[in-house]
Amino acid sequence: GPVWRKHYITYRINNYTPDMNREDVDYAIRKAFQVWSNVTPLKFSKINTGMADILVVFARGAHGDFHAFDGKGGILAHAFGPGSGIGGDAHFDEDEFWTTHSGGTNLFLTAVHEIGHSLGLGHSSDPKAVMFPTYKYVDINTFRLSADDIRGIQSLYGDPKENQRLPNPDNSEPALCDPNLSFDAVTTVGNKIFFFKDRFFWLKVSERPKTSVNLISSLWPTLPSGIEAAYEIEARNQVFLFKDDKYWLISNLRPEPNYPKSIHSFGFPNFVKKIDAAVFNPRFYRTYFFVDNQYWRYDERRQMMDPGYPKLITKNFQGIGPKIDAVFYSKNKYYYFFQGSNQFEYDFLLQRITKTLKSNSWFGC
């Protein structure tokens, strides 16, 4: 079945049951997510606006899907497996009486079960498992997942130690002057340079030594972590950010509504599932998209791909490739290409590398 293809997952509580205090609902849902994050590499964060991966809804009867609730008793809640749109969303029947204790229906216990579905688990045949299909109250203070629940979720996501295989295990800020530091995406934004890595970005103001680190979510709460490509069209005050097969448009540092959109709207063939790097050249009014060992050229005026693409990176950018992590445009004549912990200053007029640097050379390391 489907799984989330990322380890940082957002949730939003769309509305609150009147049966409980808001703080108790928040706490029950947070603790329910924590049950699963304790045994996996997954990290959950609550957002209050925008599109979350998992939407938590209290509703009664018909409520916007094919699975209308049935009044008190019977079906308590349901949740959709991982995916976009309704994928991951957890719906709780408002006709139940939701509680923090053993009376009525315990929200925490029900939420643990439903979040299991949101993460891709099916029902268990083990009566001791939280994923067993029928509700049974257990003491929430001593509640633990069963061995079957843990086996199931770890078969999908691995155990918490697998965090260590991720670039940034504990969600902490990567060391800026680590000589092995690489970046996910880099772009100019006006007179600043944004360097993206995991859920962080560094801001470098041109010609100033000081840099500051920020959470992507602190500037743009609706954007995901792990931005993979970015480019700026300064004349339009636009920045485009890419992750997987989606992109977001930022205008005047504000996310535009109606995003994300599919990268295929640029004209990429269906086999392109993500963009590695992108850069806009204002001299030619073209954007270069780098995907694996190839690149496409997009005409921003005509809003269409130029004919004759893709081309091999190594063929047309001497000394660069076969793949790149990030690229940005600067000083009217240079592309700065990032490959792992190395960076190449490339003069696009002379069509050659003019300098080799460490990726973090911009930070005075």
């Epitope: 018909a62 409520h63 916007g64 899907d65 699975h67 959709f80 749109g85 309704i86 994928g87």
Partner: antibody, heavy 122, light 103 residues
Framework: EVQLLESGGGLVQPGGSLRLSCAAS????????MHWVRQAPGKGLEWVSG????????LYADSVKGRFTISRDNSKNTLYLQMNSLRAEDTAVYYC???????????????WGRGTLVTVSS | DIQMTQSPSSLSASVGDRVTITCRAN??????LNWYQQKPGKAPELLIY???SLQSGVPSRFSGSGSGTDFTLTISSLQPEDFATYYC?????FGQGTKLEIK
């Protein structure tokens, strides 16, 4: 390439029966909800019925409940709609549609067949 | 039961125009709204899902917005191939359709 090919339509008298089939190819059929949607001549779209991946959960529009039966054969990658007690108002093009989801239906149809015409007339 | 009301039922516009079609639910459906395009004699095709997400391969001139009860489909600059009928849909309920014709 995902393909859904409906068959079994035709002319039938009121009160008669017809069985529609939808042959699926180009994707793994068994994990997805599948649906029938119809369109009367010159009219809009009307959802008719849906079936869960295992076939254990079926849903029907009120207008066809008790007369139509949806089923599937995952070994043959085929969806069926058995239509009994047909009425003139059942005249329509019947489309088979694939849901994007498994365990619960999202009601989001990402692929459709070309449709088969059912005419109920004496 | 949930009902969807789509407006207008028909619309005349010219190539290059910006066009907006609206869909209203009689109760909150969160962002669980999809838009389809249907050309004469053809099956419907998914354009927008979850209110604002563009289906793969659909041109970026199409966009969707809204949540709760009010939703819109916008075509930023009409192309000749966009003249068709558009339906909003939520689970088993479709809007009545909007026929977009050449002025």
């Amino acid at each position: 390439e995902v393909q859904l090919l409906e068959s079994g339509g035709g002319l039938v008298q009121p009160g008669g029966s017809l069985r529609l089939s939808c042959a699926a190819s180009g994707f793994t059929f068994s994990p997805y909800w599948m649906h029938w949607v119809r369109q009367a001549p010159g009219k809009g779209l009307e959802w008719v019925s849906g079936i869960s991946p295992s076939g254990g959960n079926t849903l029907y529009a009120d207008s066809v409940k008790g007369r139509f039966t949806i089923s599937r054969d995952n070994s043959k990658n085929t969806l069926y709609l058995q239509m009994n007690s047909l009425r003139a108002e059942d005249t329509a093009v019947y489309y088979c549609a694939k849901d994007i989801r498994g365990a619960y239906s999202s009601g989001l149809f990402d692929y459709w067949g070309r449709g088969t015409l059912v005419t109920v007339s004496s | 039961d949930i009902q969807m009301t789509q407006s207008p039922s028909s619309l005349s516009a010219s190539v290059g125009d910006r066009v907006t079609i609206t869909c209203r639910a009689n109760q909150s459906i969160y962002t669980y709204l999809n838009w389809y395009q249907q050309k004469p004699g053809k099956a419907p095709e998914l354009l927008i899902y979850a209110a604002s997400s563009l289906q793969s391969g659909v041109p970026s001139r199409f966009s969707g917005s809204g949540s709760g009860t009010d939703f819109t489909l916008t075509i930023s600059s009409l192309q000749p191939e966009d003249f068709a009928t558009y339906y909003c849909q939520q689970a088993g309920i479709f809007g009545q359709g909007t026929k977009l014709e050449i002025k």
